[in-house]
Structures are given as structure tokens and as C-alpha cells.
């Protein structure tokens, strides 16, 4: 819309029809140009010319929010909109006030005003922006986490939607979307949005709000899915009768009025448009739902969103098709149903879809329901390669176990490349903290072997000046290092193989590790503060550093390394999409740094680095340093936590998965 003044005065135009529609999560450019006959104006020979002042604002009934102001080549952005709005062509083209808006959210809908002031002249133009689309969570009818990547897309397509992009999920999150269920996205990553972190929903962000990610996953792994419904031209409406309808009757009822049962996606779009019905109705996928736009206690527990009626208290299963509800119909020719056989399925392979509502509703569950599942934990979707019940872990650690894990189960049997009989108990379990929030993060307790006059050390009183002792294992497997390889491994991590004295001092400072490792003198030892069955070693139930004595150099164990002070600084690096291993290397290099080594991270930890985010290190491991323990950050002890691929604490993360990074310079 243009507001021109008389001919030779300042005029501003937005050459774009209003409303301008754009998709959630995308960026948008609003062109704005001005013609300024006065330019440049000089007030007196001695003063500089006045330059026009550009102001962009968003106008609503309640208020006007200034997005940015530009004058004399300088652009000042409202801090709330920093990194969100910009003038891409200014000041290169002084009369071009085109506005760019990144990562569109639903909340960005509204009327945008481009205003130019020059001296006492003032002109403006406005444009309405409508951000289209809604992201919603989908789940197969039977149970949670059953959709591979293909089926996930099919689920969305059958519900008038497409699989959402990471940008769309991020935008929905910023609009308030919260869901503790891991779901596929279009880029083959698996993520979930969390505003109020809680046990079972921490993922890779611990107690910080944000969209959790597992990175790129294998297409055969199974999760839920996040779908994106763009828009609809038709109308969703309720059909009802005093005795209500069975599913089949509901479908027939819609047909008799020239419509069909609405899809879940269409209902979400209707809800987004303000639909509010306190009565549940059948949808095309045989689910039963109702849209609540005005919260009230007796309608969906005082929560907004599309509410779902489930068969079971753990939010799975649809009502019996013979039960009676209203019919939710859709009239419109803008959607064409894709035939079932276009997904190559039939009969028993058929899936229909259901969602958990937005915002998240946690039902009180009967005691026999898996508690972790109620909270949104991931049930590992492993083919049962172990004769045991599946391990429950939180969404952030969900992994479909690969057959390569072998048949050894979590407490390892101390497998070795060279079989040697030991007269003592061999450390057989992966070190696990009692309350590890992360299923596959190791609870390595690492103790600073440092002391300064009057300093209180936690825990205990170490006797060595400077440095840190830490346990090291290559990502692939436990007990794989010969004596030679062990020394090299420590050097590669920016450390040196520890001496028995250093390990002893660490033990006295409270260090415990139930993993046998090489030391400088070719002995193999491990420090145990609280003896337990697989860790008694040569000391039975007494605490102490267990030893196997001098071992043949060809035998394979882990290693204990020692790192002295840090020559440089370790810093935490991140970006919104995070990094693959290669991207992390490149990012550090761009900062005149390298990915930090494990040793450097331990040294930085000993100097107080505390980060509740796992980050890539130079050896392809994922670790994070915790100085102040808190429940959400790797348990109740300080130390450097390691994220492993498998629950038995072996395996490196996929180099293509996305994480933060620790750089060193």
C-alpha cells in the first residue's frame, strides 16, 4: 500500500501486493523504495547534508513495535530483533529500504510499515504479512517410535501435510511449541522441541531450553515425525447428531453433505485459524480429536491445542471404531488423497497416525506403565539381540542398536584380544554414575591433581602439583591398546601416559575408575574408592589402586594419561545447526584454532571450564566438562563426561551427527 504526497515531495512505495504470504521457518523480503526529490539537502554551506531516516515497524491493534531505524548509513536494530531483521541493500543503495526477515514465526504475521523521514517531510507505506503453516507431531496408531524415514513422510502426506524442516520446527519452537517426542525432519535428522527441560527430555541440551537433536539418523531407525501443514482453501466443520457417530457413520455423514472426513493436518490448520470445539470428533485417520482455542478446565484440561482422545492412558491407541463421537468434515477441492498403494503398503503394514497434543499433556499414569515412557523417554527400538528387556533412555540418547554391538551385554565381560587367565576379579563393568541423566554418557570421575596453598580441593587432598589424571579409551572398543599404542594414545590427546605415583595421588583425591589401564612403568592398574563385585581386583573389599603388576606389552588394556597445565585456551564453539565432526574442524580452523584434544579439555576442566553441552574433540569423541555437578548435567560428580554410541560405553558418535565443539588455541 502506498501513501504518496504531492508530486515533488518524498514518496515511499512497497511494490508488492498485500497480503504477502510466506511459509513458517523461511525468510522474507519486503521491498521498500523511496523517491526523495530533496536529496541531498544542505541546511547551510558549513553543515553536512541531512540524510533520510528509515524506520521499519510492525503495527498491530495494541501497539507499534519499531524493528529498526537507519540513518547516515548506520542501521540500529531493536535488540529483540537482532539477527532477525536487516536492510540487505542499505546503505549500498541509499534509496532502497528493503527489509529482510529471517526464520519467520507465526508471531511475525502482521502489518509492516516502511517510513522515511527527511527533514520535515515524512512518507510511509504498509504491507500485511501472513506467515502460513503449522508444525505438529505425529505418531503411528499403535505405539510410540514406529516410523522409519519413509513411513514418517507417508504419515504426513496422508494427513494433508509434508514432513517439516528443521527451520520450521525451530520457528514453531520459538512460537511456543513443546513436545518431548523425538521425530523425523525433512533433512533426515531427528529432533524435538523443549521449553521446560525435565528428566527424560534433556537430550543434547541438558537443562537449557531449545530444539534437541540426534543429528542425521539411519533411514531404518524408527521415531515419530514432525509434519508441516501449509494452508487450506476449504473449510473444516462439525457434523453432529444426538446419538453421535461410529467411525463408518461419521465418514458417511460427511459424504452426505458433499464433504469427507478431515485429516489431522486440516484440523490443525482450522485450529490455527481459531476453531474451538469442546466436543471430540472422528478424523480420516480414525483418530478422535477436538480443537481448543480458548482454554477452559472442562475442555482439554485448560490447555490450548488440538486435543486427542486415546485408548490407553500412556497416550497410544485410538478409540474403538464403534464408539460414538461427532464427525469432523472437510469441504474443499484443494487436497487430493494419495492412494494407499502409492506407498507400497497394504494390509498389516498399514499405519494410521495420531498426535500428542500441543502443548504437551502428561497424563497421570497407572503404575504398570513405563515411567520413562510417560515422561517422553525413548524406548530403544532394537531387534532383541540381547536376552533382556530393552533399556530406556531419554530422547536425546535414542539409538536403534545396531547388530554390530555383538552379544556382550552392558556389564562387559572384559573381552580381550589376548586371553590370559587372571587370579583376581577383572573390572567387568562400564563405569556408570548412580544418577547419570544421559544413558550413554560415561560417569568418568576425573580428579584434579593440583593444590595451591590454602586451597580446598574437592574431593580429597591430592598430593601432586599441577595436572590431571584421566582414563582414556579409543572410541571403538574397550581394552584395545597395547603398551606402545597406549603411550601414543596419550600423546595424541595432548597428554602423557601417567605414572603410578600420579594415579595414586589421583586416587587419594577421590578418583575412581573400574577400568584397567596401562601406566608409564608398564604396569596395569585402576583406582577403586568404593569396591564392588566386578572391581575388587587384587584388594578384595578394601579401597585402593588395584594392580595387575607388569604386563607383557602385547596385552591390551585402556590407559591412564596425565596432562599438565594448558598452554593456550580451550573455548566452546556452537552455532544454531551445530556441527558435524568435519564442520567442527573447519569452524575451529576459521577461529585460528584446532579442535581441542581430550587432554586439553581435561586440563581446561581442571582450570574451571564447566559446560553442560557435549562437543566434538580432535579424536572424534564427544565430551563435556562439569565442574559444578547438577542432576541435568551428567550426574552428581564433577568430571569430564563422555558420550558413547553404545550403552556399554564404546563406539564413537557418527561423524555426521551434529554437536557443539571445543576448540583450542
Amino acid at each position: 500500500e502506498e501513501v504518496p504526497d504531492h508530486d515533488n515531495s518524498l514518496s515511499v512505495s512497497i511494490p508488492q501486493p498485500s497480503p504477502l504470504k510466506a511459509l513458517l521457518g523461511t525468510s522474507l523480503t519486503i521491498p521498500c523504495y523511496f523517491i526523495d526529490p530533496m536529496h541531498p539537502v544542505t541546511t547551510a554551506p558549513s553543515t553536512a547534508p541531512l540524510t533520510p531516516r528509515i524506520k521499519w515497524s510492525r503495527v498491530s491493534k495494541e501497539k507499534e513495535v519499531v524493528l529498526l531505524v537507519a540513518t547516515e548509513g548506520q542501521v540500529r536494530v531493536n535488540s529483540i530483533y537482532q539477527d532477525k531483521v536487516s536492510l540487505p541493500n542499505y546503505p549500498a543503495i541509499p534509496s532502497d529500504a528493503t527489509l529482510e526477515i529471517q526464520n519467520l514465526r507465526s508471531n511475525d504475521s502482521g502489518i509492516y510499515r516502511c517510513e522515511v523521514m527527511h527533514g520535515i517531510e515524512d512518507s510511509e507505506a504498509t504491507l500485511e504479512v501472513i506467515v502460513k503453516g503449522i508444525v505438529f507431531h505425529y505418531r503411528a496408531i499403535s505405539t510410540r517410535y514406529t516410523l522409519d524415514f519413509d513411513r514418517a513422510q507417508r504419515a504426513c502426506l496422508q494427513n494433508s501435510a509434508i514432513i517439516a524442516t528443521p527451520e520450521q520446527l525451530q520457528a514453531a519452537y520459538e512460537d511456543g511449541f513443546h513436545q518431548c517426542d523425538a521425530g523425523w525432519l525433512a533433512d533426515q535428522t531427528v529432533r524435538y522441541p523443549i521449553h521446560t527441560p525435565r528428566e527424560g527430555c534433556y537430550g543434547d541440551k541438558d537443562e537449557f531450553p531449545g530444539v534437541r537433536t540426534y543429528g542425521i539418523r539411519d533411514t531404518n531407525e524408527t521415531y515419530d515425525v514432525y509434519c508441516f501443514a501449509e494452508e487450506m482453501e476449504g473449510e473444516v466443520f462439525y457434523a453432529t447428531s444426538p446419538e453421535k457417530f461410529t467411525f463408518q457413520e461419521a465418514a458417511n455423514e460427511c459424504r452426505t453433505v458433499g464433504a469427507r472426513l478431515a485429516t489431522t493436518g486440516q484440523l490443525y490448520l482450522a485450529w490455527q485459524g481459531g476453531m474451538d470445539m469442546c466436543s471430540a470428533g472422528w478424523l480420516a485417520d480414525r483418530s478422535v480429536r477436538y480443537p481448543i482455542s480458548k482454554a477452559r478446565p472442562n475442555c482439554g484440561g485448560n490447555l490450548l491445542g488440538v486435543r486427542t482422545v486415546y485408548l490407553h492412558a500412556n497416550q497410544t491407541g485410538y478409540p474403538d471404531p464403534s464408539s460414538r463421537y461427532d464427525a469432523i468434515c472437510y469441504t474443499g477441492e484443494d487436497f487430493v488423497d494419495i492412494p494407499e498403494n502409492f506407498f507400497g503398503v497394504g494390509g498389516e503394514e498399514d499405519i494410521t497416525i495420531q498426535t500428542v497434543t500441543w502443548p504437551d499433556l502428561e497424563l497421570p499414569l497407572p503404575r504398570n506403565i513405563t515411567e520413562g515412557e510417560a515422561r517422553g523417554n525413548v524406548i530403544l527400538t532394537a531387534k532383541p539381540i540381547f536376552d533382556m528387556s530393552p533399556t530406556v533412555s531419554e530422547p536425546g540418547e535414542a539409538l536403534t542398536l545396531a547388530p554390530e554391538v555383538g552379544t556382550t551385554v552392558f556389564p562387559e565381560a572384559g573381552e580381550r584380544t589376548e586371553k590370559t587367565t587372571r587370579p583376581w576379579g577383572f573390572p567387568e563393568e562400564a563405569t556408570r554414575g548412580p544418577d547419570s541423566a544421559t544413558a550413554f554418557a560415561s560417569e568418568d570421575l576425573v580428579v584434579r591433581v593440583t593444590i595451591s596453598p590454602g586451597a580446598v580441593e574437592v574431593p580429597g587432598q591430592p598430593r601432586l602439583p599441577g595436572g590431571v589424571v584421566f582414563h582414556y579409551r579409543p572410541g571403538s572398543t574397550r581394552y584395545s591398546l597395547t603398551f606402545e599404542e597406549a603411550q601414543q594414545a596419550c600423546i595424541r590427546t595432548g597428554a602423557a601416559i601417567a605414572s603410578p605415583e600420579q594415579l595414586q595421588a589421583a586416587y587419594e583425591a577421590g578418583y575412581e575408575q573400574c577400568d584397567a589401564g596401562w601406566l608409564q612403568d608398564q604396569t596395569v592398574r585402576y583406582p577403586i574408592v568404593s569396591p564392588r563385585t566386578p572391581c575388587v581386583g587384587d584388594k578384595d573389599s578394601s579401597p585402593g589402586v588395584r594392580t595387575y603388576g607388569v604386563r607383557p606389552s602385547s596385552e591390551t588394556y585402556d590407559v591412564y594419561c596425565y596432562v599438565d597445565k594448558l598452554e593456550g585456551e580451550v573455548f566452546f564453539a556452537t552455532q544454531m545447526e551445530q556441527f558435524t565432526f568435519q564442520e567442527a574442524q573447519a569452524f575451529c580452523a576459521a577461529q585460528n584454532a584446532t579442535l581441542a584434544s581430550t587432554g586439553q579439555l581435561y586440563a581446561a576442566w581442571s582450570q574451571g571450564l564447566d559446560k553442560c553441552y557435549a562437543g566434538w574433540l580432535a579424536d572424534g569423541t564427544l565430551r563435556y566438562p562439569i565442574v559444578n555437578p547438577r542432576p541435568a548435567c551428567g550426574g552428581d560428580k564433577p568430571g569430564v563426561r563422555t558420550v558413547y554410541l553404545y550403552p556399554n560405553q564404546t563406539g564413537l558418535p557418527d561423524p555426521l551427527s551434529k554437536h557443539h565443539a571445543f576448540c583450542f588455541r
Epitope: L157, S160, A161, A186, D187, T219, D334, V336, G344
Partner: nanobody
Framework: EVQLVESGGGLVQPGGSLRLSCSAS????????MFWVRQAPGKDYEWVAS????????YYDDSVKGRFTISRDSAKNTLYLEMNNLKPEDTALYFC????????WGQGTQVTVSS
């Protein structure tokens, strides 16, 4: 902005062949199921073929099985439909689609099979 642009249509004799292309932009093509849909004059839309995101699975309407082949080149963000042994009943406007929403499809390319 999401765009799907079809090309390759034309007039062909019965028994002849055509290869339709659809150039995609503005979305993650490599992560999307893709479809060919057609609409004959005065008729409803008819789904012709589908292909999954990796290209490993393809499905066809019974009327075109054995004659049509759907494929994709994710490096070029392009979807194809190879049509052999064309019949007069294949005459239609052919659309490339990534969802059931008609408004998100391309403009279509006309295929006419006539002697």
C-alpha cells in the same frame, strides 16, 4: 520459495515415448517423496507414480505399470517420468507433486497422445 517446474510434454503418436522432467527448488528435494499426478480433460486427478526420498522404492497406478518409470536425480533436484508405449488414454496435463495439496504443485505439462 518452493517451485516445481514440469517440462517435456508434447504431442506423440500411440506407441510413442516421452520423458517428463520436473525441476524442484526451495525445499529439501533429497528428503521428499515425490509424485506424478495427471488430470485428463473433464476428469478427476489421477495419481500416476511415486518415488521415495532415496529413490529405492517406486509405485505405479495399475494403468501405467510396465510402461512408465519414475526416477529422480537428487544431485540435480530433478524428478523424471519415462513414458513408453503411450496410449490415447494417457492424454492429460501431468503435474509434479510433493504433497496432496494442489496449490503446491507445478503448473503442469500437457501430454497428448493422438494419431
Amino acid at each position: 520459495e518452493v517451485q516445481l517446474v514440469e517440462s517435456g510434454g508434447g504431442l506423440v503418436q500411440p506407441g510413442g515415448s516421452l520423458r517428463l522432467s520436473c525441476s524442484a527448488s526451495g525445499f529439501t528435494f533429497s528428503g521428499s517423496w515425490m509424485f506424478w499426478v495427471r488430470q485428463a480433460p473433464g476428469k478427476d486427478y489421477e495419481w500416476v507414480a511415486s518415488i521415495n526420498s532415496s529413490g529405492g522404492r517406486t509405485y505405479y497406478d495399475d494403468s501405467v505399470k510396465g510402461r512408465f518409470t519414475i526416477s529422480r536425480d537428487s544431485a540435480k533436484n530433478t524428478l523424471y517420468l519415462e513414458m513408453n508405449n503411450l496410449k490415447p488414454e494417457d492424454t492429460a496435463l501431468y503435474f509434479c507433486a510433493r504433497s496432496p495439496r494442489v496449490g503446491s504443485w507445478g503448473q503442469g505439462t500437457q501430454v497428448t497422445v493422438s494419431s
